[in-house]
Structures are given as C-alpha cells and as structure tokens.
C-alpha cells in the first residue's frame, strides 16, 4: 500500500475553516490522481469530498463541495470550509493513483479536526 502522511491534529479557525496537507509517497509520477476526504466519527465513515486531478493541474471539487485544494508534486493542500462544532472528527485522506496502471491506493491515519463554534457576540446597548 502507498504511504500517506497527514497531520495528527488541526484546529479549525473561528470561521469554521480547516486546512491540512496530505502527502503521498508515490512510486513515480501518476498522471491522474484521485483524492478523497473521509470523516470518521462514532465508528461511521462518510465521504466529505473527492476530486480527481491530472498531475500538474488544479484539484477540481464539485461546485457545491465544502472542500478546495491545490496540488504540488506529491502533496495536496486541502481546505474544508463551513465546519461547525458538530463536525469535529477524524478526517482521513485517501489517495488513489488512477493512471497509468497499476492502481495504487493509500490511506492516511487521519487528521483530528477540532471545531469550536464561536461565542455569539453579546448585544450592546448604547
């Protein structure tokens, strides 16, 4: 299996944005790579987002995706937006080398993303 590295812990910003790098130890230069972000919480695994990209081009997620990303060599910089406290969980990076063959699969150990909802601003009387 292909080795995939990602940070153990990331804290989302007060605006609910979390970014992390997913690095894969490719055996060479795949021309087509698929990156999937999975969320594991309470032993349930759900797909957060996925993108297939041609090496050297930008990652393209679906228009309604909460993810954006850029790639550089064997690194993918992923950003997840619109996170709330209930979205805290383990976010796993899955990388697939789709072309040329053979197919390679790598799954990271996951990044624990902590999301803290901001305190509402108290009303102020003037």
């Amino acid at each position: 299996a292909m080795h995939v590295a990602q940070p153990a812990v990331v804290l989302a910003s007060s605006r609910g944005i979390a970014s992390f790098v997913c690095e894969y130890a490719s055996p060479g230069k795949a021309t087509e790579v698929r990156v999937t972000v999975l969320r594991q919480a309470d032993s349930q695994v759900t797909e957060v987002c996925a993108a297939t990209y041609m090496m050297g081009n930008e990652l393209t997620f679906l228009d309604d995706s909460i993810c954006t990303g850029t790639s550089s060599g064997n690194q993918v910089n992923l950003t997840i937006q619109g996170l709330r406290a209930m979205d805290t969980g383990l976010y796993i990076c899955k990388v697939e080398l789709m072309y040329p063959p053979p197919y390679y699969l790598g799954i990271g150990n996951g990044t624990q993303i902590y999301v803290i909802d901001p305190e509402p601003c108290p009303d102020s009387d003037f």
Epitope: P27, G28, K29, P100, P101, P102
Partner: antibody, heavy 118, light 107 residues
C-alpha cells in the same frame, strides 16, 4: 514475487547488433508498469537506456535513441533490447528493471555482462 | 539531461559510524529522488524513494532527506553489511539519471 532475468550472448563483435532478452515472472508486463533497460560500464555508474510500457509505448535515452529498439513478446512475458552498431564503449553489465511511470526501479534482474570485442 | 552530482566518490568508515552521502541535482527535481545500494556482482537494491521513504524491508538506520536540488542519504550506525556502493537517482524528468556512486569502504 516479481522476478526479472536477463539473457544474452555475452560477446558481440564491433559493428554488430546486440540482442538481450528479459524474462519476467510473477507479473504480466501488459498489466502495468514500465519495463526498462539500464547499463553499467565497468567500475562506473548507471545509465538508463529506455523502456517499453505496459501499453507497448517506448521511450529511449536521447543519447542512444538512434541505435536502440526495445520490443516485447507478450506471449512469453518477455521484453528485449536491440542495440545496433556496437563498439567497445557498449561493453557493460546490462540490467532489466521495472518502474512506475517516471518512477524509481523497484525490481531488477541480476544483470548480464556484455563484451564487445573482435 | 539532469546531472546528479554525488559526493564523496569514496568514503572510509568504521562499524558504528554515522555516514552521510549527498547528491546535488542540476535542476529542481522536487522530491523525486531514490537511493540504491549495490554490492559487487549484484543488481542495485532500492533503499529510499520519494526522498525520504524507506523501501520495504530496509532497516531504520537508513534515512533520506532533502528537496529541490540537494539530497542526503544517512546511515545512522554502520553495520558490516552496509559496506557497498550507493547511488542516487532522479526520476522527475526523462531521461532518468543516476549519480556516479559513493563507494563505502571499511576503515
């Protein structure tokens, strides 16, 4: 376990064409990867010669391109190197090796020594 | 072609020593660098790929680092079986190229 095994004549006369074969076991050469020839001059470093891909595509080192042909026999799971107009400078140990596209070489043959001499 | 300049060309060391071999690429090759070990009469064996990842079964005393143009192979504590020739290899751009090798000898 993937294994590669080179075979060839050992001795070739100058100006002749060298022919070497690499027999692959444990993996089909049409299923994936790129199948390469690399040589090592006596006491020297390694020189990549070229590849034939799982799909039959070729790419050769520009420094040798005019003299090199790499082909395959899928029924025997073999690929071959032909190097024309050889000179003493082609005396070397020739290795076959496997890699992912533009990748490092994970499996190698044990090498076959080729001497060019009259 | 990308030149891989390896140094030193030879090195004498003792069992237990820490040894560092360097390789400089003539242009940026990202992290697409591998290291091989070769013993006389044998084929090279992969040690490190993608700059810093150990190939399956390679002992943890072997490590790699670098990016761009400068790369290093380190053997943290030499063992008797480590005396061999080491080659770096760039696989960023065809034609694929190798360093000239570093012969590691017993002092």
């Amino acid at each position: 376990q993937v294994q590669l095994q080179e075979s060839g004549p050992g001795l070739v006369k100058p100006s002749q064409t060298l022919s070497l074969t690499c027999t692959v076991s444990g993996y089909s050469i049409t299923s994936g990867y790129y199948w390469n020839w690399i040589r090592q001059h006596p006491g020297k470093g390694l020189e990549w010669i070229g590849y034939i891909g799982y799909d039959g595509s070729n790419y050769y080192n520009p420094s040798l391109k005019s003299r090199v042909t790499i082909s395959r026999d899928t029924s025997k799971n073999q690929f071959s190197l032909k190097l024309s107009s050889v000179t003493a400078a082609d005396t070397a140990v020739y290795f076959c090796a496997r890699n992912y596209y533009s990748g490092y070489f994970d499996f190698w043959g044990q090498g076959t020594t080729l001497t060019v001499s009259s | 072609d990308i030149q891989m300049t390896q140094s030193p060309s030879s090195l004498s060391a003792s069992v237990g020593d820490r040894v560092t071999i360097t390789c400089r690429a003539s242009q940026n090759v990202g992290t697409y660098v591998a290291w091989y070990q070769q013993k006389p009469g044998k084929a090279p064996k992969p040690l490190i790929y993608s700059t810093s990842y150990r190939y399956s079964g390679v002992p943890s005393r072997f490590s790699g680092s670098g990016s761009g143009t400068d790369f290093t192979l380190t053997i943290s504590s030499l063992q008797p079986e480590d005396f061999a020739t080491y080659f770096c290899h760039q696989y960023d751009t065809y034609p694929l190229t190798f360093g000239a090798g570093t012969k590691l000898e017993l002092k």
